[in-house]
Structure formats: structure tokens, C-alpha cells
């Protein structure tokens, strides 16, 4: 159930040189610098778990301050083969190559990894996010142009002793940052091919990983303040649940979405917040250091154990899913958007999940570890938590089993 | 700055269609909701209805919807109005707006005028 | 849809006086009202948003307050450039709507 199977050499420990790698904000993602070709080129790169490409700008964009130049780089090898990725909104494409990559600040290793080279996007580059490309570290099988493509993660792993292991730790601020702030701040971290102790507290508890695509999971339970929402646990995983740094929102599937909107705004009725609060599309704001925290309810959501019939829970506070924007019209206010939006592809527990929680995507085990977060925002009240074993009868009936068709999957 | 600038002025025939364009800059064009926003002398402000960049998900008023269509391109930064089948009850001036709290950035204004 | 009244179209005040302009909402919206400025030919000017809020930069001559269904719009000293329209606005439900404004004029 927790972390309490005998020390592996390499999989333990202190990570010193990977802690704090990571910068950028839940709004826009979080990202690691990495060096592609030779001589190196340097590019900041969104650590995306809900992919599985490792994608970079390589033409002139202008949201980009940099791009890779294929051109400049001896080590570069051209796949003359195309990729292109289209979202539900917004698209990249690009031409297929491989070249040498590394992580400065990860393990001292290169790796020859495949590349797409982004030459023209829609909807994909955020301005001012100080990020220039996509590293995807889900599995082969919804990689781009097909699952022949060997993912960064499985090349790192394949050509190098690094541990089939990585973790996350995505800190976010607790108010908003301005661009100044976020080049300066800390983001968090990305440990491969290990667990740093240093990053959370408590215990690390494991849920399998159902099927090797997307990081998928299966809820069996969600709690809004202690109440159950006493749905059939199938409609929480329609049509499926991922763990996605990529995603800032915690997203959930509209019969879900709807009833836990209900919940909390019940929980929360002393104030009236507009309808367009529930959407994201209106802030609410209060004077500087008065946000009420305390009338907003914790949200706990049960994940399948490891062990038969055993469950544990995660549970975040309003200061996950509230996410502080700066506005200057507003500027001398505390305000927040909501951060839980419905979905047409199941649940997504994106950076709003994860910013409570270190996260532990331990491949070679095929699970996920969630402890308590080192760096989560919380109050002198209440505290994110990771609690277990519960015991949940009938969890495997929470999976839903997608139909297969030739289909796409990648519509995000 | 937050700057939202509009199009200018057009004269169009009735029965003619017309697409009038919000360009945003100042601020992440994909983080908030755009809103439109229509003004007829004497008939104080209409909410037309409203685009979310991030997704090009809309919501409209009711007695807008088979009159308006809003779309985005985020290349550009830019929100999009199309008016079709249009009358002389369309001859207004229209603003964009950007949402906050309530709609505390507007654009400069477009006369739309509707005459044979 | 939610009906905001403005009763009155316009008021007579003077430079240096004190004035309030009312709005009443058909319907309960909270604090989730907003308050604009209007000049002619131009775009309006928000002022105040959750009833009582005032944007930044606007002059603290400018007062909101008001819950549920009543709203209020206080100019202390009114300068000769608040001699404009205003319109109370509710967001919180969809459709928004707008108050049919109300003209500050010189006695």
C-alpha cells in the first residue's frame, strides 16, 4: 500500500542537482530547460504528461524568443517523415528527425531521442510562457505519427541506466506571478529516475496505472467536504482519468462536473458567487488578505489501491483549485478564477491536482505515488492530504472499457 | 497596457452580412473571455454574448443567437463578430470587452450602420 | 432574464454636490453588480464591480453600495467631468444586463 518495499539503489534519496528544475506557473505549465543538438542548443520545454512527442519550435514563431535551428546542429538526422497533431482547438505539425538531448539540470547523461520539429502551430505556443517546446512523457501508444515513435522517456531509459522512474513536484505560488517573478521563481521539480524524500512528507501511496497510454487511473469515490457525491463510480472515469502536468485545470466529466459544481456551491452559499464564476470565465476577488478560505469545501477523490479491495484518498483545499490571476484593474484585490472545468474526455487531474502533491509516475511498477506535497499552499486550518487504506468493494468496475475503434485518441 | 482595438465603421446593405474584429494585446489573449456588446440610441447596452479564447467555447443571449456568430483566432489575438441578414434594428454601435471582474476592459466602439 | 432598473433618466446636481443614482435588480444577484461611466460617443468606463469595489484609478469620490436588490452609485463632490451617463450592470447570470442609464445634468 505505501512506500515500505526495500531500498533500490538509485530509485532513493537525494537528487540535489534535479530539485527546483522546473519553472513557470499552473496558467501556463511548468518547464525544464534542456539542450538539444550539438553544440548544444538551450530551449525551456513544458513537462507534459499527457503526451507522448517531444516536440520544439524550429521556425520563427512570434511567440517564441527562441526556436531550435536544425541547420546549426552536426548531430541532427533527418526521419523525412512529417508528424501533425491536431487538438479539439489548435494543432501543431512538423517534420520528424533525431538529434542529442539533455537535461542540465537531471541526470549527466545524452541520449539520441526523436524530435519533431514544429514548423507551424495554431493554439499551441503561449505567449509570455517562456516555454519553446513539449516534452511528452506518457507512453508510446498516443504518440504522434503512431506508436512506432519511441518516446523521449523510453530513449533515456533504453540508452542509459536511469531508472524506468520519474516524479514531479509542481509548487504553485499561492498568488499571482508577473513575468519578472515567474523567470525568477521556483516552479518545483522533476526527479528522474527517482524519489526525493526532501519533497514531500507523509507517506507515498500507489495506485496501479490501468493501462499504459495516457497516465491512467481509476477513481473510485469523490468526496466534497467529507459528503460523498454518490455517483456510479464509472461516470468518474468516463471515459477514462489521467494525470496531466500539461492540463492546468482539474477537468471533470460534465455529469460529474455539474454535480460536484453543486456541492461546492452549496458548500460555500454564505457568499454568492456569479454564474460565470463556475464557468472561469468571471474572477471573484477580495480585499488583500481576506480570501475566506474557510467557506470553500475540500475535494477528496479515491483512488484505487494496490492492494485488492483497498483504497486511499487525495485531498486538495480551495488553494489548489482557486487559482490566483493578477489583473490590474483589480489590482488592489486578492483574485481567483475556478479551476475545476468540465470535460468531454473523462476526468483530468491537471495541475490543480498535482500542485498539492508529489507525484511519483513509477513506470517500471506500472503505478503512481501521490504523497503530501513539500511546497503546497496551505492555511493554519486545513492541509492537502494522502490518507488510507479505505476499503472500496468492486473497484474494477469503475474503469470504463472505451470502445475501440480507428479513431484518433489524441483529441485534447 | 491592456488594449482591445476594434474595426472601424462600416455601411452595409440590408439583407448583407458584416464581420467586425477585437484585436487583444497587454495580456494573455487565451486566460479570459471576450464579450460583445451592442449600444442603440436611446436603447442603453445589450449583451450580445461571449467567446473563451481558450477553447472558442461561446454563450450567447438568446435574442442574439441566430443574429451573431463569435469566433477567435489566437494566432492574432483577434475575436471575431459576424452580424448576418442584417436590418436597420442592427444599425448600433458594438463594443468588445474583456472579462474580469464584470467587464473592466472595453474596446474603443464600432458604428455598424444598416442602409439601402 | 434579470430586469435592471434605473427609475431615474436624469438627475439635476451642481459641481462640489453630493448625489446617488439607484438601480434595483427584478431579482436577487448578490454583490455581483458593476457601475460604468459613459461620455458621450465613447466607450464606457467601468467604475465600481462587486457593488462596492472600485476599479483602479478611479477617484475615491466614487462610492458602491448595495446587496441583493438595491443598489446605490455615491458622487461625493461632483466634478464638472461627472456630468455623464451611468449604467449599473448585473453579471451574475447570464444574460448580462444593463441598467437604461441615468444622466447627470447641472441644476
Known amino acids: 500500500e505505501t512506500d515500505e518495499e526495500p531500498e533500490e539503489p538509485g530509485r532513493r534519496g537525494s537528487f540535489v542537482e534535479m530539485v527546483d528544475n522546473l519553472r513557470g506557473k499552473s496558467g501556463q505549465g511548468y518547464y525544464v530547460e534542456m539542450t538539444v543538438g550539438s553544440p548544444p542548443q538551450t530551449l525551456n520545454i513544458l513537462v507534459d504528461t499527457g503526451s507522448s512527442n517531444f516536440a520544439v519550435g524550429a521556425a520563427p514563431h512570434p511567440f517564441l524568443h527562441r526556436y531550435y535551428q536544425r541547420q546549426l546542429s552536426s548531430t541532427y538526422r533527418d526521419l523525412r517523415k512529417g508528424v501533425y497533431v491536431p487538438y479539439t482547438q489548435g494543432k501543431w505539425e512538423g517534420e520528424l528527425g533525431t538529434d542529442l538531448v539533455s537535461i542540465p539540470h537531471g541526470p549527466n547523461v545524452t541520449v539520441r531521442a526523436n524530435i519533431a520539429a514544429i514548423t507551424e502551430s495554431d493554439k499551441f505556443f503561449i505567449n509570455g510562457s517562456n516555454w519553446e517546446g513539449i516534452l511528452g512523457l506518457a507512453y508510446a501508444e498516443i504518440a504522434r505519427p503512431d506508436d512506432s515513435l519511441e518516446p523521449f522517456f523510453d530513449s533515456l531509459v533504453k540508452q542509459t541506466h536511469v531508472p524506468n522512474l520519474f516524479s514531479l513536484q509542481l509548487c504553485g505560488a499561492g498568488f499571482p506571478l508577473n513575468q519578472s517573478e515567474v523567470l525568477a521563481s521556483v516552479g518545483g521539480s522533476m526527479i528522474i529516475g527517482g524519489i526525493d524524500h526532501s519533497l514531500y512528507t507523509g507517506s507515498l501511496w500507489y495506485t496501479p496505472i490501468r493501462r499504459e497510454w495516457y497516465y491512467e487511473v481509476i477513481i473510485v469515490r469523490v468526496e466534497i467536504n467529507g459528503q460523498d457525491l454518490k455517483m456510479d463510480c464509472k461516470e468518474y472515469n468516463y471515459d477514462k482519468s489521467i494525470v496531466d502536468s500539461g492540463t492546468t485545470n482539474l477537468r471533470l466529466p460534465k455529469k460529474v462536473f455539474e454535480a460536484a459544481v453543486k456541492s461546492i456551491k452549496a458548500a460555500s452559499s454564505t457568499e454568492k458567487f456569479p454564474d460565470g464564476f463556475w464557468l472561469g470565465e468571471q474572477l471573484v476577488c477580495w480585499q488583500a488578505g481576506t480570501t475566506p478560505w474557510n467557506i470553500f469545501p475540500v475535494i477528496s477523490l479515491y483512488l484505487m489501491g494496490e492492494v485488492t479491495n483497498q483504497s486511499f484518498r487525495i485531498t486538495i483545499l480551495p488553494q489548489q483549485y482557486l487559482r490566483p490571476v493578477e489583473d490590474v484593474a483589480t489590482s488592489q484585490d486578492d483574485c481567483y478564477k475556478f479551476a475545476i472545468s468540465q470535460s468531454s474526455t473523462g476526468t483530468v487531474m491537471g495541475a490543480v491536482i498535482m500542485e498539492g502533491f508529489y507525484v511519483v509516475f513509477d513506470r517500471a511498477r506500472k503505478r503512481i505515488g501521490f504523497a503530501v506535497s513539500a511546497c503546497h499552499v496551505h492555511d493554519e486550518f486545513r492541509t492537502a492530504a494522502v490518507e488510507g487504506p479505505f476499503v472500496t468493494l468492486d473497484m474494477e468496475d469503475c474503469g470504463y472499457n472505451i470502445p475501440q475503434t480507428d479513431e484518433s485518441t489524441l483529441m485534447t | 497596457e491592456v488594449q482591445l482595438q476594434q474595426s472601424g465603421a462600416e455601411l452595409v446593405r440590408p439583407g448583407t452580412s458584416v464581420k467586425l474584429s477585437c484585436k487583444a494585446s497587454?495580456?494573455?489573449?487565451?486566460s479570459y473571455w471576450i464579450h460583445w456588446v451592442k449600444q442603440r440610441p436611446g436603447q442603453g447596452l445589450e449583451w450580445?454574448?461571449?467567446?473563451?479564447?481558450?477553447?472558442?467555447?461561446?454563450k450567447y443571449n438568446q435574442k442574439f443567437k441566430d443574429k451573431a456568430t463569435l469566433t477567435v483566432d489566437t494566432s492574432s489575438s483577434t475575436t471575431y463578430m459576424h452580424l448576418s441578414s442584417l436590418t436597420s434594428e442592427d444599425s448600433a454601435v458594438y463594443y468588445c470587452?474583456?472579462?474580469?471582474?464584470?467587464?473592466?476592459?472595453w474596446g474603443q466602439r464600432t458604428l455598424v450602420t444598416v442602409s439601402a | 432574464d434579470i430586469l435592471m432598473t434605473q427609475s431615474q433618466k436624469f438627475m439635476s446636481t451642481s459641481v462640489g454636490d453630493r448625489v446617488s443614482v439607484t438601480c434595483k435588480a427584478s431579482?436577487?444577484?448578490?454583490?455581483?453588480v458593476a457601475w460604468y461611466q459613459q461620455i458621450s460617443g465613447q466607450s464606457p468606463k467601468p467604475l465600481i464591480y462587486?457593488?462596492?469595489h472600485r476599479y483602479s484609478g478611479v477617484p475615491d469620490r466614487f462610492t458602491g453600495s448595495g446587496s441583493g436588490t438595491d443598489f446605490t452609485l455615491t458622487i461625493s463632490n461632483v466634478q464638472s467631468e461627472d456630468l455623464v451617463e451611468f449604467f449599473c450592470?448585473?453579471?451574475?447570470?447570464?444574460?448580462?444586463?444593463f441598467g437604461g442609464g441615468t444622466k447627470l445634468e447641472i441644476k
Open positions: 431579482q436577487n444577484v448578490g454583490r455581483n
Open positions: 450592470q448585473q453579471y451574475n447570470s447570464y444574460p448580462y444586463t
Open positions: 462587486s457593488a462596492s
Open positions: 497587454g495580456y494573455t489573449f487565451t
Open positions: 450580445i454574448g461571449m467567446i473563451d479564447p481558450s477553447d472558442s467555447y461561446t
Open positions: 470587452a474583456r472579462s474580469g471582474v464584470a467587464f473592466p476592459y
